[in-house]
Interface confidence: low
């Protein structure tokens, strides 16, 4: 017989992974010179599962979803030169710098630190 | 140098998986006799990624989240006997019977069919 719901283990031969991958990010703004910066992106495969509902519900809904997202990030100012705009010769862009990533509940707000 | 954001491909070496696993589900209701039914649950590892934001935004936000959830399910009536309730000798419960599963956008409403 198949296992009951509470024995539906996340199989040990499959492991969740969520990594901070190094990327080159292009920061741009209309009419300004783009800048390339080194940053990180989160990429991975986290576990999710969905167990059937009943109505009326007899137990709490067994739906679980983790997503690979920033576990820690901070905002950094990147100043772009805008040679064609005499009145606005430069523009400051806020860039999210990702520090590290982890599998977290889908829909969770990312954790940001100050500049 | 690391690849630019738009080259951050999901490498074919890691493949997403999302399966319908056979389970034994206990359908219960207060004061009624529980029933065991055969059902399926969705379990898997889908891809998710999160690329850093800028503010003001220069491109669309590159956040992607897939979750393993029912791709097709239907509601089925399971009747429970309630011997201690003379005025309500039986209770009908609606049970979600999962047909098959797939990686779908996190937060997407599952696709249900009629009874």
């Amino acid at each position: 017989a198949p296992p009951p719901i509470n024995k539906l283990a996340l199989f040990p031969d499959k492991s969740a992974w969520c990594e901070a991958k190094n990327i080159t990010q292009i920061v741009g703004h209309s009419g300004c010179e783009a800048k390339s910066i080194q940053n990180r992106a989160c990429l991975g495969q986290c576990f999710s599962y969905s167990v059937p509902n009943t109505f009326p519900q007899s137990t709490e809904s067994l739906v679980h979803c983790d997503s690979c997202m920033p576990a820690q990030s901070m905002w950094e100012i990147v100043t772009l030169e805008c040679p064609g705009h005499e009145e606005v010769p430069r523009v400051d862009k806020l860039v999210e710098k990702i520090v590290h990533c982890s599998c977290q509940a889908c829909g969770k707000e990312p954790s940001h630190e100050g500049l | 140098a690391p690849p630019p954001i738009n080259k951050l491909a999901l490498f074919p070496d890691k493949s997403a998986w999302c399966e319908a696993k056979n389970i034994t589900q206990i359908v219960g209701h207060s004061g009624c006799e529980a029933k065991s039914i055969q059902n399926r649950a969705c379990l898997g590892q889908c891809f998710s990624y999160s690329v850093p934001n800028t503010f003001p935004q220069s491109t669309e936000s590159l956040v992607h989240c897939d979750s393993c959830m029912p791709a097709q399910s239907m509601w089925e009536i399971v009747t429970l006997e309630c011997p201690g309730h003379e005025e309500v000798p039986r209770v009908d419960k609606l049970v979600e019977k999962i047909v098959h599963c797939s990686c779908q956008a996190c937060g997407k409403e599952p696709s249900h069919e009629g009874l």
């Epitope: 990594e19 | 080259k7 491909a9």
Partner: antibody, heavy 118, light 112 residues
Framework: QVQLVQSGAEVKKPGESLKISCKGS????????IGWVRQMPGKGLEWMGI????????RYSPSFQGQVTISADKSISTAYLQWSSLKASDTAMYYC???????????WGQGTMVTVSS | DVVMTQSPLSLPVTPGEPASISCRSS???????????LDWYLQKPGQSPQLLIY???NRASGVPDRFSGSGSGTDFTLKISRVEAEDVGVYYC?????????FGPGTKLEIK
């Protein structure tokens, strides 16, 4: 700087065992794959297998499955290629390379020459 | 396994002239994510291979812009707009869509 440094040349006899190494530095060792590529004398490149040190996920070419073992120790940022019983036909240059998945091997080791002769 | 073929196998070129190498795969290398899983590598005499082009058409870091990759599906081309003496060596294409990745036999570029 980002580099992969391989262990030195080896001369072995048939039937002997061998483990060669590839040490990564200057980058996050667990965030990329490490592949092994064979080049027999005067010949082309052959893909042997690949490992993701982050979770030790390992893939082998069917031609090399059971002939070699690929492993990694992420605590010292080192990947390994080993043989339990060498044959004369294992004589070749072996390269390790950093991959983005199975594609884009962007950093290569200097190669380890393995000579098997009685 | 996916079989890779290259032509020509030998390519004598005069410095300053363009050069073109063709690579064909026995099945499509276009993944559902839109990328062609084909790389180009150059192995200079006595050296380790080096990445030139990845995912079909993306030049690797530090590779001169005289190198370009094109093509999709099963037919790919590496072009050198103006060959220089330092470009001599063996050029390999490699498919990475199917395990195991497989290399072409190589094209030996030499200076006339």
């Amino acid at each position: 700087q980002v580099q992969l440094v391989q262990s030195g040349a080896e001369v072995k006899k048939p039937g002997e065992s061998l483990k060669i190494s590839c040490k990564g530095s200057g980058y996050s060792f667990t965030s990329y794959w490490i592949g092994w590529v064979r080049q027999m004398p005067g010949k082309g490149l052959e893909w042997m297998g690949i490992i993701y040190p982050g979770d030790s996920d390992t893939r082998y070419s069917p031609s090399f499955q059971g002939q070699v073992t690929i492993s990694a120790d992420k605590s010292i940022s080192t990947a390994y290629l080993q043989w339990s019983s060498l044959k004369a036909s294992d004589t070749a240059m072996y390269y390790c390379a950093r991959g983005h998945g199975a594609t884009a091997f962007d950093i290569w080791g200097q190669g380890t020459m393995v000579t098997v002769s009685s | 396994d996916v079989v890779m073929t290259q032509s020509p196998l030998s390519l004598p070129v005069t410095p300053g002239e363009p050069a073109s190498i063709s690579c064909r795969s026995s099945q499509s290398l276009l993944h559902s994510n839109g990328y062609n899983y084909l790389d180009w590598y150059l192995q200079k005499p006595g050296q380790s291979p080096q990445l030139l082009i990845y995912l079909g058409s993306n030049r690797a870091s530090g590779v001169p812009d005289r190198f370009s990759g094109s093509g999709s599906g099963t037919d790919f081309t590496l072009k050198i707009s103006r060959v220089e003496a330092e470009d001599v060596g063996v050029y390999y294409c490699m498919q990475a869509l199917q395990t195991p990745p497989t290399f072409g036999p190589g094209t030996k570029l030499e200076i006339k």
